[in-house]
């Protein structure tokens, strides 16, 4: 996307970021938790393989910054990363950013409430030292470490509610939807690809809504 322009293409698009393909397409060999996106993905097989590793080379991000993250918790972070790297259905929520490592990000993706709830439930006894994982880390070693004086505590201490986790963790990349999985109105982090990708319908719905809103704004602007 042209950095000076807002996106007009909201469907079946890849974000302009560090590891994304420029164009979505089939990826037969997507690894493990990223395999639901095989039929149409913005990530490569090697990206999908790498993101399953602890402190992967993709971002040098260490999930275990406060001791070993419980596997039941870690799988949600892997799935979150698969959605981020692989989904071609997040176009309606792509925003331009001026960051050294990416030109675009997602903002306020409506995450299905059960996916957020389960994420929180599976993680709230693991430990972390920060409530926003985008910024404020000590990167002097090349890997994220807790900044001086930031204490490791349970997730529940830093994220007292599911919304605090899903919305605060990545600076509002997600917002918790009131809608449920299967409603066609919220993005599922987890899905069974045998039934197709439910997020395609969700993207179509919000893209259409944005199109209508944009038309109304234009109409409104014309009259004032």
């Amino acid at each position: 996307a042209d950095p000076g322009q807002d996106r007009t293409d909201l469907l079946n698009v890849c974000m302009d970021a560090k590891h994304h393909k420029t164009k979505p397409g089939p990826e037969d060999k997507l690894h493990d938790q990223c395999s639901p996106w095989k039929k149409n993905a913005c990530c490569t097989a090697s990206t999908s393989q790498e993101l399953h590793k602890d402190t992967s080379r993709l971002y040098n991000f260490n999930w275990d910054h406060c001791g070993k993250m419980e596997p039941a918790c870690k799988r949600h972070f892997i799935q979150d990363t698969c959605l981020y790297e692989c989904s071609p259905n997040l176009g309606p929520w792509i925003q331009q950013v001026n960051q050294s490592w990416r030109k675009e990000r997602f903002l306020d993706v409506p995450l299905c409430k059960e996916d957020c709830q389960r994420w929180w439930e599976d993680c709230h006894t693991s430990h972390t030292c920060k409530s926003n994982w985008h910024r404020g880390w000590d990167w002097t070693s090349g890997v994220n470490k807790c900044p001086a004086g930031a204490l490791c505590r349970t997730f529940e201490s830093y994220f007292p509610t599911p919304a605090a986790l899903c919305e605060g963790l990545w600076s509002h990349s997600y917002k918790v939807s009131n809608y449920s999985r299967g409603s066609g109105r919220c993005i599922q982090m987890w899905f069974d690809s045998a039934q197709g990708n439910p997020n395609e319908e969700v993207a179509r719905f919000y893209a259409a809504a944005m199109h209508v809103n944009a038309g109304e704004m234009l109409h409104h602007h014309h009259h004032h």
Epitope: T125, C152, S157
Partner: antibody
Framework: EVQLVQSGAEVKKPGASVKVSCKAS????????MHWVRQAPGQRLEWMGW????????KYSQKFQGRVTITRDTSASTAYMELSSLRSEDTAVYYC???????????WGQGTLVTVSS | SSELTQDPAVSVALGQTVRITCQGD??????ANWYQQKPGQAPVLVIY???NRPSGIPDRFSGSSSGNTASLTITGAQAADEADYYC???????????FGGGTKLTVLG
Amino acid sequence: EVQLVQSGAEVKKPGASVKVSCKASGYTFTSYAMHWVRQAPGQRLEWMGWINAGNGNTKYSQKFQGRVTITRDTSASTAYMELSSLRSEDTAVYYCARDISYGSFDYWGQGTLVTVSS
Amino acid sequence: SSELTQDPAVSVALGQTVRITCQGDSLRSNYANWYQQKPGQAPVLVIYGQNNRPSGIPDRFSGSSSGNTASLTITGAQAADEADYYCDSRVSTGNHVVFGGGTKLTVLG
């Protein structure tokens, strides 16, 4: 495996000071807060204070303010609790405990008996 | 005030359910944590936060809270559960911690 190992029993005279150590292993010492709790014979647990092992910041119970000092040596992964102006009612078992969530102490030292007697 | 109040003693028949309570103003805005202490031993955390059990703690232990009261419930009490139980809580003002007076649990039978 996380372990907190405390120094041995002490007998002190009234008016003296005592310094109890708590050596941590099995985790990153500077990433967690360490609290000190005491228990007089047959009595309830009593919170004394805590230290942020990362930056050294401390908070003390008002009851012990001015008499207690909690410090740490990060190179030795050890926390210390010093109590001064001892009196007989300070006779107690003193525990260090790791904090995982604002007063949730998941690991405790084995305890150090301090006896104050003339 | 920052006091936490517990009943001094509670008894339960073997295999029955018992509830130990902890009351205090700090519990309106903070969760209670629960510790089991046996004679001559250090306390052991059994419930913390919303209702979390550390690994190794049997699932017969559970926690709940309402208003200014927190409860520890033992469903199907065992002889090994006979001990003193203490609650504690963060006092938000000043990040202090306060303990309850402890409840001596006796398992009968």
